[in-house]
Every structure is written in C-alpha cells, then in structure tokens.
C-alpha cells in the first residue's frame, strides 16, 4: 500500500493547525513540563515491517483524535481550529485504515506489533492522567499540545521512512 502524498500533506497541515491552537503564552507554563515517556522506539521504523509501522501510525493518530474529541478538549481550544484539526486527523485515519487492511493481508502481523500498539496506548494514558491530575488547566493543555506536536513530528518522520522503503 502506498500512502498518498496527500496523507503527508495532511499530517503537515495537522501540525500547523495544532501550532496555531495555543491560547496562552507557553512561557508561563515552564514549571508544568512533564515526562510522558514518549515511546520513541515505536517511531523508529527500521525495526518494523511495513504493516507494523502502519498499525503504529494508525494507533497514534487514533489516540490523538480521541484526545482532542473530548468535552474537555472542546472547552480548551478555539472551536474552528479544533474542528479543522480533527478533520485532518480523520482523513489520515481513513488513509491508514485502507492501508492496514491491505498490508495485513500481505504480511502476518507478529505479536511484537501488539506490544508497540500497547506502548502507544499507555503513552496516551499517561497524557490523559496528567490532564486529570492537573484538572485540565490551560498550562496542562499547553504542555500536552507541545507533546502531541512532538509525537506527530515523529509520525511524519516514520511516514517519510516508509515512503523511502517503497
């Protein structure tokens, strides 16, 4: 499955939108920084077969979509930007779902992939727990926004590596 060029553009657009969503100066939130322990090895791409990498990407985008689809998220961000951001993620999910179905038919997805998906889920659980502990404060959301921008950047890099493998 060849991910369309539009998928990569969509990821870039999502990053730009997320960058525009900030409502307060991040300089006031330095002391709220938190180690979410991003599972960087899951974005490496070299250790994965293509089907595994696509599954990890799908999980990453799905969890991001879920995080920004909550009521608490709606209260935190400017509505029109949030809707555009969610639309970009939704389109990416559709692209990836088509690929997941296609690739899993070609390769048997090993158990290692389940571990990778679980690592991504646990990462998002840590993010959600942080927001709960910080009572969804503006600074907590600002820290999470920065973290998601970072993980989306990793996703973009993984997509680039996938395209080079084709």
């Amino acid at each position: 499955c060849d991910l369309p060029q539009t998928h990569s553009l969509g990821n870039r657009r999502a990053l730009i939108l997320l960058g525009q969503m900030g409502r307060i100066s991040p300089f006031s939130c330095l002391k709220d920084r938190h180690d979410f322990r991003i599972p960087q090895e899951e974005f490496d791409g070299n250790q994965f077969q293509k089907a595994q990498a696509i599954s990890v990407l799908h999980e990453m985008i799905q969890q991001t979509f879920n995080l920004f689809s909550t009521e608490d998220s709606s209260a935190a961000w400017e509505q029109s930007l949030l809707e555009k951001f969610s639309t970009e993620l939704y389109q990416q999910l559709n692209d990836l779902e088509a690929c997941v179905i296609q690739e899993v038919g070609v390769e048997e997805t090993p158990l290692m992939n389940e571990d990778s998906i679980l690592a991504v889920r646990k990462y998002f659980q840590r993010i959600t727990l942080y927001l709960i502990e910080r009572k969804y404060s503006p600074c907590a959301w600002e820290v999470v926004r920065a973290e998601i921008m970072r993980s989306l950047s990793f996703s973009t890099n993984l997509q680039k590596r996938l395209r080079r493998k084709d």
């Epitope: 330095l30 002391k31 820290v143 970072r150």
Partner: antibody, heavy 121, light 107 residues
Framework: EVQLVQSGAEVKKPGESLKISCKGS????????IGWVRQMPGKGLEWMGI????????AYSPSFQGQVTISADKSISTAYLQWSSLKASDTAMYYC??????????????WGQGTLVTVSS | DIQMTQSPSSLSASVGDRVTITCRAS??????LNWYQQKPGKAPKLLIY???SLQSGVPSRFSGSGSGTDFTLTISSLQPEDFATYYC?????????FGQGTKVEIK
Amino acid sequence: EVQLVQSGAEVKKPGESLKISCKGSGYSFTSYWIGWVRQMPGKGLEWMGIIDPSDSDTAYSPSFQGQVTISADKSISTAYLQWSSLKASDTAMYYCARHPGLNWAPDFDYWGQGTLVTVSS
Amino acid sequence: DIQMTQSPSSLSASVGDRVTITCRASQSIDRALNWYQQKPGKAPKLLIYFASSLQSGVPSRFSGSGSGTDFTLTISSLQPEDFATYYCQQSFDFPLTFGQGTKVEIK
C-alpha cells in the same frame, strides 16, 4: 547535523545600534525556542531572554527587559538580538542556544559559537 | 527570581580524583536543573539535564543527583580534559538563572 551559527564579532561605539544573528540548521527551527546568554569578560553566564520562533513570542530576564530586543525570522531560520543604543557595559560574548520549549527534552543542548561584541569609544 | 548558588567557586584536583560540585536553589525547583561545562574561549556544553539525565555523548564519569533545592554534579574520575568551569542552571521557571560557576583547576 544540528547547528547554530552566529554572526561575526562586532566593534561599536557607545550610542550605536547593533543586531546580531543566530541561524539554525539541521532541525525544525520552529519546534525549539532560542535563548540568548551573555558572558561578560571573565564572568559567568547570564540568561537574557528567549523567543519562540513559531510565533515570535518572547520572554526577557528583568535585568535585560527594555535593554535589548529579541526577534526571529522563521522563513530563514534565524533569531536576532539587537540594541538601539549600545553602552560600554554591553561589551561581552553573546551566545544563542536552542531550548525544547515545553517538551521534556534537554535544555540548551546546542549552542552557537558566540558573538563577541566590543563597545568602546 | 530563583537564585542559584554553587560551591565551591573553585577547586584544585588531580587526574583520577573524584570531584563533587554542589548547587543550591533559593526555592524548590523539583528536578529542573541542568549542568554545563565551559572551556576557555568555547561555548558551554550541556552535561546533565533534569538533575540526573546524562546528555548524549557525555562520558559516564559525569553524574548528577538531587531534587528540590539541593543538587550535585559528580565526576567519578577526573580526566585531563575535564579541567574547565562548570555551571548549574535552573529551568523550572522564568527568568532562567545560572549559578556563578565552579572552576576546576589542576592541583
């Protein structure tokens, strides 16, 4: 390879204006903040201020607020430090360094080579 | 502002010595403390971030510890290239502040 390359040494007279630069390469320039640090001859490090190049939001140390202006041009991945009226006491080495912003990552992990500013009549 | 106080301001040591530098913050900064090494005429170099994380490429003889207000940088076995000035810096809140530096000299 991540690099921060600063403009060359400057010799100025008191009262003159100056703008020094710091060009980033090898990474996404808008994903990191750029901080400026002063080191006067034989002295320690002093943090001056910082900029988020994605939107040019700035924060200054109270000691430097109103004395200098920090700016950035993300289209050319460059941050600037400027003075409108230099004083002899501004003679120092000035460093730029990148900062991960709100991400849990190493602070000031890459530094420019420094720009020596000499102000003398 | 958060004041950072380093001690000692200078020390003399021999190659192979274990060297300890301390840094005290005027208020709790959790673990938001970095250590830098600077050699004459050169830019500072990050050694330790978030109190105890070793920066990539830095030799394992360097280690950091502490949280709250009291922090330590330890060089387990001093090497000739370690003679330099060391600075702590808090990254807990703005304005960011550095310690005054500790110069490590050859005995």
